[in-house]
Each structure stands twice: as C-alpha cells, then as structure tokens.
C-alpha cells in the first residue's frame, strides 16, 4: 500500500528531477511510456475503486489528445529550431561577409587616402606643368613665327606657276622650257633681258597622280630674288598671263601661314579695290593702299583698326570686314595671283 505508493512516487519524483524539463522530456518516447505505466499502477491500485471504466477511457482520450497536441507542438518547435539554426548559420555568414567588407572598406579608405595624396601631388605637378606649358606655348609661338619667317625667307626667290598643263614626260629641262615660253609669250621686256637664271624648277607635289583634276603647280627657284619680283610685277602690270592663249597664274611661293595671313585680308582688299583705293598685298602679308594721297602699309588688322578710328568714312566702309572673326569664311583675293 502506502509504502509502495510512496516509494513509487519518490522514484517518480526522482525520475522527474533527474530528467530534463518537460519539453525536452516529451521528445523521448521511453520516458512517456514509463510515465503512463506509473499512472496505470495507480489506477490499478486505487483508480478502479474511485472511478469507473468510462471515466478512465475519457481520461485516456484526453491524454491522447494532449499527447497529440504535444507532439504537434514538438514538431513546430523542431521546425522553429531548424529554421533558427539556418538563420544563425546565415547570420554567421553575414557576420563573416560584414567583417570582410569592413576589411575591404578599410583598405579602400587607405587607398583613397593614398589616391588623394597622389591627386593633390599631381595637381601641384599639373599647375607647375601649366606654368611651364604657358612658357612653352610662348616659346613655340615665337619659334613658329621665326620658322614662318625662315620658311618665307627660303621661299623668297620662288615663283609658283598655277594652271600650267602637264604632259606625260616632264623633266627639269622641259619645265625650264615652259617657263621660257611663259616669259616669251607674256613679258617681252623680261624676254629681251639676259638669260633667266634658274636654280631649280619642279612640279609640286612631286608625285604625279592621274586622278588630279587640276595640274600640279610648278615651283621655280630663281638664283636672284629680283627676277621673281620682276616677273610678279610684270604679271601684275599685264593683268592676264597666258600659255598658248590659256590663262595661268603666277604667285609668290609662300609659307602656309603667310598665305593664310594674306587670305585674311581678302574681304578688306576687295572692298578697297571696289572703291578704287588701289590695294596691294606686299611681301610677306602686308596690306597697302592709297589714302589721302599716300601709300599706307598695314601689318595686321589691328593696325588698320587703329588707323580707321580717326577716319570715319573709311571706318564705315570697312566696319563689317574688320569685325569679322579670324575663322570666318574669307573671300579669296580678287587677282590674288598678281600680288
């Protein structure tokens, strides 16, 4: 009786205290079994006395449901635990990634600092280079100017013949003969002078191309500048230079820069010519015209601007031409060849 029950109870309590909390215990089927057996012992000894069989069945059903619920709860718990484990794993991964990113950020920050240092150093260098560049630009401009002057000086004894038809077989002698023909056909006064001394004569560019629509120019290099100047003067006086009756042009052979400078006088030259100021472009690119009975010379547009400020009529006449931007479409000089 009592001792037995107590003993069992004690055993039972021992079992309970020694075992883990209910939730954990419920996960072990062996424990469940022993717990039910104890209950049945109690029922055998005392239960039948106190209640009838139906009560016992109800109780068993209730217990069964409880067990079911318990199992369901247990499953949910297991799922939650699994999910939590998964989340933990992901969190750990994120933590690792975060650590890596932190490291990367740290290295990027240090690299940015280094770059900033380098950029500021480069800025200093650039400023220095800019200063040097300005000096260099000035030097280059000076060099270009002197190169242009040298080039013009080298080309000074040269005459450019434009529009002279090309023949299949051409050599120095043939071209020299062509020049002789031009002189004989157009410039009797020069023709009667002593033999024209030529240092060199050639087509330019030197390579012949059958695809060219117009004949290549002929460059004549005289031994004396005077001869070139005499020919240009004679061409200017004659007005129309021909070879076999067909018009050709004679010009000074100038550097590209000087040619551009001459071209820039175009609109002004044409206006002055129209109004009978007798304009001329003299070597290398000076504009001259007759004003107030005198020949006035102008090296550049600014010089002309300064000149016209005190001459309202001339200022009005050249107003537009003088305000044209350098890169405007310059009209070619009329009879520019005869300059």
């Amino acid at each position: 009786g009592m001792g037995k029950k107590q003993n069992r109870k004690t055993g039972n309590s021992k079992t309970q205290s020694a075992s883990p909390p209910p939730k954990e215990r419920s996960s072990s089927p062996a424990t469940e079994q022993s717990w039910m057996e104890n209950d049945f012992d109690e029922l055998r000894e005392e239960g039948f006395r106190r209640s009838n069989y139906s009560e016992l069945r109800e109780d068993i059903q209730t217990k069964g449901k409880e067990v079911e619920n318990f199992e369901k709860n247990l499953e949910e718990c297991i799922t939650r635990i699994t999910n939590t484990e998964k989340c933990l794993k992901e969190l750990m991964e994120l933590k690792t990634k975060a650590r890596e990113l932190r490291e990367e950020c740290r290295s990027l920050r240090s690299r940015c600092d280094q770059l900033e240092e380098r950029v500021s150093a480069m800025e200093d260098e650039m400023n220095e280079m800019k200063r040097e560049g300005k000096f260099r630009e000035k030097r280059i401009k000076r060099n270009e100017q002197s190169l242009q002057e040298i080039w013009d000086y080298v080309k000074r004894p040269n005459l450019r013949l434009i529009g002279v038809p090309e023949s299949d077989v051409e050599n120095g002698t043939k071209l020299e003969n062509t020049l002789q023909d031009i002189i004989q056909e157009n410039f009797p006064n020069l023709a009667r002078q002593a033999n024209v001394q030529i240092q060199e004569i050639q087509r330019t560019p030197q390579r012949y191309s059958s695809r060219r629509a117009t004949p290549r120019h002929i460059i004549v290099r005289f031994t004396k500048v005077e001869m070139k100047e005499k020919m240009l003067r004679a061409a200017r006086e004659k007005g129309r230079v021909t070879l076999k009756g067909k018009p050709i042009r004679l010009t000074a052979d100038l550097s590209a820069e000087t040619l551009q400078a001459r071209r820039e006088w175009g609109p002004i030259f044409n206006i002055l010519k129209e109004k009978n100021f007798q304009p001329r472009i003299s070597y290398p690119a000076k504009l001259s015209f007759i004003s107030e009975g005198e020949i006035k010379y102008f090296i550049d547009k600014q010089m002309l601007r300064d000149f016209v400020t005190t001459r309202p009529a001339l200022k009005e006449l050249l107003k537009e031409a003088l305000n044209m931007e350098r890169n405007n479409r310059y009209q070619p000089l009329q009879n520019h060849a005869k300059m």
Partner: antibody, heavy 121, light 110 residues
Amino acid sequence: QSLEESGGDLVKPGASLTLTCTASGFSLNNYVMYWVRQAPGKGLESIACIYTGSGTTYYATWAKGRFTISKTSSTTVTLQMTSLTAADTATYFCARRTYTSDSYAGSFNLWGPGTLVTVSS
Amino acid sequence: AYDMTQTPASVSEPVGGTVTIKCQASQSIGSNLAWYQQKPGQRPKLLIYAASYLASGAPSRFKGSGSGTEFTLTISGVQCDDAATYYCQQGWSSSDVDSTFGGGTEVVVK
C-alpha cells in the same frame, strides 16, 4: 595642216603692202607664227613673230617701225609693210614655230610655199 | 642676243662621203636647235629638231648632235639629192628675232 601666203606683188619703192598667211587644220594659239623672208640668193631672215594667244609680238631690229605683224582672225596672220625699198625684194614665208616646251622644241615644223614681193621703180 | 654662227659657208663632197656642218650659239640654248634643208625655189624642210631628233620623212643618214652652244649636223653617205643649203635655227628665244637662223651652209655633191 597647211599654211598659205598671199598678197605678194610688184610695188614701187616707198609703197605699202600687206601679206596674209592663212592657216588650216590647226589652232594658231598653240604656236608662234613667224614671217621669214629670203632675198634672192641669200639666207633665211626672220622679220617678226606673234604669240597669237596673248598678242605678244617681237621684231627684228631692222624691221621695227616699218613692219607690223598681227592676228586678224582665228586663222589668219598678216604682215603690214610700209616704206618699201629694193632691199625688201624677197620671197616672204609664213612659218609655224612650236613652243620651246613642246616636243619639237621651238622648231619650224610647217612652212607656207612663200609669196614673192618685188620692190622696183 | 643668241647669235648663231654656222660653218662652213660652203662644202663640196663626193657621193658617199661625209659632210659635217657646225653651228655655234653665243649663249646656251639647251637642246633647242633645229636643222633645215632648202633647195632652190622651195620652202625649207625640217630635218632635225631638239638637236638630235630626226623629223618624219627625213632620211636616216642625217644625224644631229650637241647641246648648249655647240651643235653638229652630219650627213653620212652623201647622195646627189642632198645637194642643198642647210640652216640651223635656235628654238630657245623667240624674242631674239634677229638671231633665229644661222647664215646657212651650201652643200655641193660631186
């Protein structure tokens, strides 16, 4: 291609005469046209030439002032002669001279048969 | 002036012989020299142009040479038909009308 002179005649000293050279089969512009004369038993003597394209003319020293060469049409060149003397008696040839730069290098590659001018009282 | 001096004024050569006529320019005329043959009562006929080129219709026994100021006309294997007066002409300066032609060389074939 041919040249034909005309206008040759027997004239009195002091008279004037105009000779005409007619070209056919070529453009005068591509050549220098000459008048050349030859007195009986003498050599060839150039009188004057004309660049028909530009109108530039040249004369022998002795011909200046008395002789005038000109292009009167696209096919004719004339030689006007004034104050003629017995010394001007000769056969007058019209000749075509190539340009110096041409392959014929300034030679006379076409001649007329000549026209006779006699100056006699 | 480009004075043209022709030598000799006259030359006599048997058939089959060689005749040499010289022409000298007072200044260089490059290769701008021509030779002409003229028979009595006829117009001059172009033989040689550009100093050494044989004109079409001219016999190959005629040969031109020289450049600058000295020029030569050579007739090799002279034939009776070659009896004529020969003139040199400078083709460089048309402005020098006075000195267009040399004085001429009469060739007599024996």
